[in-house]
Amino acid sequence: KSSNEATNITPKHNMKAFLDELKAENIKKFLYNFTQIPHLAGTEQNFQLAKQIQSQWKEFGLDSVELAHYDVLLSYPNKTHPNYISIINEDGNEIFNTSLFEPPPPGYENVSDIVPPFSAFSPQGMPEGDLVYVNYARTEDFFKLERDMKINCSGKIVIARYGKVFRGNKVKNAQLAGAKGVILYSDPADYFAPGVKSYPDGWNLPGGGVQRGNILNLNGAGDPLTPGYPANEYAYRRGIAEAVGLPSIPVHPIGYYDAQKLLEKMGGSAPPDSSWRGSLKVPYNVGPGFTGNFSTQKVKMHIHSTNEVTRIYNVIGTLRGAVEPDRYVILGGHRDSWVFGGIDPQSGAAVVHEIVRSFGTLKKEGWRPRRTILFASWDAEEFGLLGSTEWAEENSRLLQERGVAYINADSSIEGNYTLRVDCTPLMYSLVHNLTKELKSPDEGFEGKSLYESWTKKSPSPEFSGMPRISKLGSGNDFEVFFQRLGIASGRARYTKNWETNKFSGYPLYHSVYETYELVEKFYDPMFKYHLTVAQVRGGMVFELANSIVLPFDCRDYAVVLRKYADKIYSISMKHPQEMKTYSVSFDSLFSAVKNFTEIASKFSERLQDFDKSNPIVLRMMNDQLMFLERAFIDPLGLPDRPFYRHVIYAPSSHNKYAGESFPGIYDALFDIESKVDPSKAWGEVKRQIYVAAFTVQAAAETLSEVA
């Protein structure tokens, strides 16, 4: 059978039929349904939602829909012993306490089981001491404090503002600096956009609003007690002392009303420069401790949360492929939320639901995709990407042999300005071609393509006339598929204007105010941006699952490899003397990149010319494309990060959310001037260049003619 016979409809008609079936009104309805009560991981409510989704996906027409459960380490506040922070006087009396919960949004006052703000996986403890303000608690902030200002955080409680980097990195940095507790807060400079009202009158964060979130440093491990293996019924679990990535000091988040009360009394050193000042009416003094009048007062944390092994449930739906059922294209997003999940994750889950419905409609009309499509509703993403990682660990042998691509589907929106895409270079051309075929939803771009509005609003910094596409980092469920298994991955959502809105994420992220009404009133009343994201995500899945030749262009990898090699070389060249002294050469890497470029070019020529009616040759060429991403995996992983195995990309060691290129070399070079043993340090740089050069060369050879 030819592909067209197998799938019953001509390819163009298929894609159009699929896209035309997607409806904004359905996404709106699904979002409402998913956001009426909290769906915290490990709770009965989230289990019930899993069963509802299972049932509806079956009704939509998928071949099978199963629940996959795991017993993983989660973290919850103590219901009878709330977490809070106090200012205490010299007698130990609490003269101020931070809030115990957020004021509920209108209409939700009687909803039960709203988890109060907490930092998931914080250990218990009641440390007290002087406060030190550490800005965003980034690596460079601690360098400024310790090296330039000579401020010692040892034995202090640090207060850091949310934003710029993943909160787990902030906590890790504070621990390394010797802090005995961490207070995280949302500063209006980062979470209150000028000229916009606070919720419920606008999309800004009110003073009582607080960002929840986990503070783990898992580095891709999944469940902290079963790294590398699924947390199944017969799992061997580590003791809590050996668990991966748990913080060692108490941590708690607060809103800016409470932060004002802590920061207004700060004394000690003045902020080093304006980049350390937020928007509160406080001096932003660094400390340590309070000013003269209040110098005998201290800060005390009261943290009583518990870590508990708890059952979680993924929903896995299958639409079997007609021609290549053993090739999997995966669309996955999480279902668990901190509270209502109005944006995170349900704006994404509603889109997945509508994509499943559309695929199901085509299937009921007799169509099947060429390749198998797997749909996933992941659990416990908010607790460290646990559901997706455990499932991938359980199915790793199948995935590494059969996984074509993974498309992530968390929040569909973080703004309503333009498209944002992060993906493997293999998908650049797919994304470009698809967005040229889709209509832009943006005002002022009526009748224009999505590609055009996207390129105008978010131009590529390197290539004129093209849109920006970013590197994949982490902080979401694609991590295990891309960084550990080497499956080509991508993600797309609508975003804000980063030029005019310099706050981090969206203001109400992980707060109780992330409701259906937030989306329906302020972000996307017509659900046109949600529909566009559904078309992009769904369109990518459709093409990946249905095109005869996989829509991957290996030449785009060659282009970025050269760019990344140039970048890492220029970083190294900031140390010309040491490069000379220790005979550090990048020749092997540049040579490998050159070879990759030439081989990729020849492969692309052969791809144009080969006989697509020969199923063996077709399968061979497609396998070379599928396995190219896999070829960038080093089985030994990155130093001290065994589950980050991709040699070209890894989450930044300083910010999990950001992607770093040639991470092994980058980390070896980072702060190298401060290393006590320069010979050893530069030896590691040379080793990492060797690993990178070998990997690029080995990947290139997978594209060579097979014999």
């Epitope: 809070y84 101020f96 306490n97 931070t98 809030s99 115990l100 919960f101 957020e102 004021p103 509920p104 209108p106 006052e109 009110p206 003073g207 009582g208 609003g209 809103g255 009303y257 409470d258 004002q260 009360k261």
Partner: nanobody, 123 residues
């Protein structure tokens, strides 16, 4: 209709106790800090006590500190003032008043008042 209704006032002897209640309707008590304010005969208004929306902080006027306790039951939409060791100078009309700002951590301007309940302390 948005309203606050105080109850529990009356005449008591010095040293005795009273418990005032304030029932809220037409708005969610759970989102707002609440105050007790009093007005002695022929005098101006005096702030007595404040409790944050979540009960995490309570503030008192020096004149009542250690004798009065403000509390709330958000599930019942009710605010309380437990008054112990009453003195003649506590004689006043007691009003509950809703804070203007959602989630405020310290007393702010009031925007809704009750009709008041009279407390008379005399021997």
């Amino acid at each position: 209709e948005v309203q606050l209704v105080e109850s529990g006032g009356g005449a008591v002897q010095p040293g005795r106790s009273l418990r005032l209640s304030c029932a809220a309707s037409g708005f969610p008590l759970i989102s707002y800090g609440m105050n007790w304010v009093r007005q002695a005969p022929g005098k101006g208004l005096d702030w007595v006590a404040f409790i944050t929306y979540d009960g995490s902080n309570r503030y008192y006027a020096d004149s009542v500190k250690g004798r009065f306790t403000i509390s709330r039951d958000n599930s019942k939409n009710t605010l309380y003032l437990q008054m112990n060791s009453l003195r003649p100078e506590d004689t006043a009309v007691y009003y509950c008043a809703k804070d203007r700002i959602v989630g405020a951590r310290v007393p702010d301007a009031y925007d809704i008042w009750g009709q008041g309940t009279m407390v008379t302390v005399s021997s």
